[in-house]
Interface confidence: low
């Protein structure tokens, strides 16, 4: 999953909704202005914030890589959810790429779990 680097100089477009911070924080879907006096809404489909925050910018929405499918699109309060395409899975140890699932089990083993976007097939030894 790639996140484009943010431009801290980005400024809100005039039409963006604004409100006042509460105790120095802005609600999900917003970021704080440079002088900390206003909350500025994130741009739908472009960036987001999930928690009360005092970011000077919203977080850039993730773009799904090739080999991934977009399960949920980005909103102002939630990042894009990307999932590995069928037949591939994401390992906990290397979450940045989707790996191909094994097509079968080694000799003497049987498949007990199918390939999912989160895990490879699972093989266990045949009972002798």
């Amino acid at each position: 999953i790639t996140r484009q680097s943010l431009d801290p100089q980005r400024r809100a477009a005039p039409q963006q909704k604004r409100s006042s911070p509460i105790e120095g924080l802005c609600p999900p879907g917003h970021h704080i202005s440079e002088d900390s006096r206003e909350c500025i809404s994130c741009k739908y489909g472009q960036d987001y914030s999930t928690h009360w925050n005092d970011f000077l910018f919203c977080l850039r929405c993730t773009k799904c890589d090739s080999g991934e499918v977009e399960v949920n699109s980005c909103t102002t309060t939630r990042n894009t959810v990307c999932q590995c395409e069928e037949g591939t899975f994401r390992e906990e140890d290397s979450p940045e790429i989707c790996r191909k699932c094994r097509t079968g089990c080694p000799r003497g083993m049987v498949k007990v779990k199918d390939c999912t976007p989160w895990s490879d097939i699972e093989c266990v030894h045949k009972e002798s």
């Epitope: 790639t2 996140r3 680097s5 943010l6 801290p8 911070p21 105790e23 120095g24 704080i32 002088d35 900390s36 006096r37 925050n53 005092d54 970011f55 000077l56 910018f57």
Partner: antibody, heavy 121, light 118 residues
């Protein structure tokens, strides 16, 4: 125990390059933002650059923008600062500091001992 | 004019209480900022002391004793670091930093050199 150990400092000629490293231990490096802060001899603290937990977002002081590059290798628990086109005014002790959060804030809770960079002909 | 102003030097006697000041330029409102304080003893790296936003939203650095405390004066646009029961090891440079907790870039004050008189 949190430990940050900088290395790579030394004497370099103006226009030259240097790469600083910071080896982190005692905490889950990949879940914290990191910074480089410098201090010229007899002067105050100057923030140089910051990088978020994943390395996807990097920020620089105007004085080093376009010349310095901050990066990290979470597999090696290491933070780096590639310094190019060095100037005499870059002479300073360079500190590696851990951010209190995954992102970047003004809350730098742990600092290394620093490494001295001298730019002189 | 710098964003943050700190007096270059202050002194106080051993065992007393001192209050260091960090003034935010008046085009910013300290009411919506956190104030951060760092200590740097001679020959040592800086050390995070504390963050202060309000009485209900503040944090102390690792192993920082409660003798060090923060406060703000919104009317004067100032942040303060109070050190009680001054000890010889408190002799150091003190830097403030201020702003939204997740501001992208950092600005430190120019620092105040504290001398502890015996």
């Amino acid at each position: 125990e949190v430990q940050l150990v900088e290395s790579g400092g030394g004497l370099v000629k103006p226009g030259g390059s240097l790469r600083l490293s910071c080896a982190a231990s005692g905490f889950t490096f990949s879940t914290y933002g990191m910074h480089w802060v410098r201090q010229a001899p007899g002067k105050g603290l100057e923030w140089v650059a910051g990088i978020n937990y994943s390395g996807n977002n990097k920020y620089y002081a105007d004085s080093v923008k376009g010349r310095f590059t901050i990066s990290r290798d979470n597999a090696k628990n290491s933070l780096y600062l590639q310094m190019n086109s060095l100037r005499a005014e870059d002479t300073a002790v360079y500190y590696c500091a851990r951010d209190h959060s995954t992102w970047l804030s003004r809350h730098l809770d742990y600092w290394g001992q620093g490494t001295l960079v001298t730019v002189s002909s | 004019q710098p964003v943050l102003h700190q007096p270059p030097a202050m002194s106080s006697a051993l065992g007393t209480t001192i209050r260091l000041t960090c003034t935010l330029r008046n085009d910013h409102d300290i009411g919506v900022y956190s104030v951060y304080w760092y200590q740097q003893r001679p020959g040592h790296p800086p050390r995070f002391l504390l963050r202060y936003f309000s009485q209900s939203d503040k944090s102390q650095g690792p192993q920082v004793p409660p003798r060090f405390s923060g406060s703000k004066d919104v009317a004067r646009n100032r942040g303060y670091l109070s050190i009680s029961e001054l000890q010889p090891e408190d002799e150091a440079m003190y830097y403030c930093a201020m702003g939204a907790r997740s501001s992208v870039t950092h600005v430190f004050g120019s620092g105040t050199q504290l001398t502890v008189l015996s």
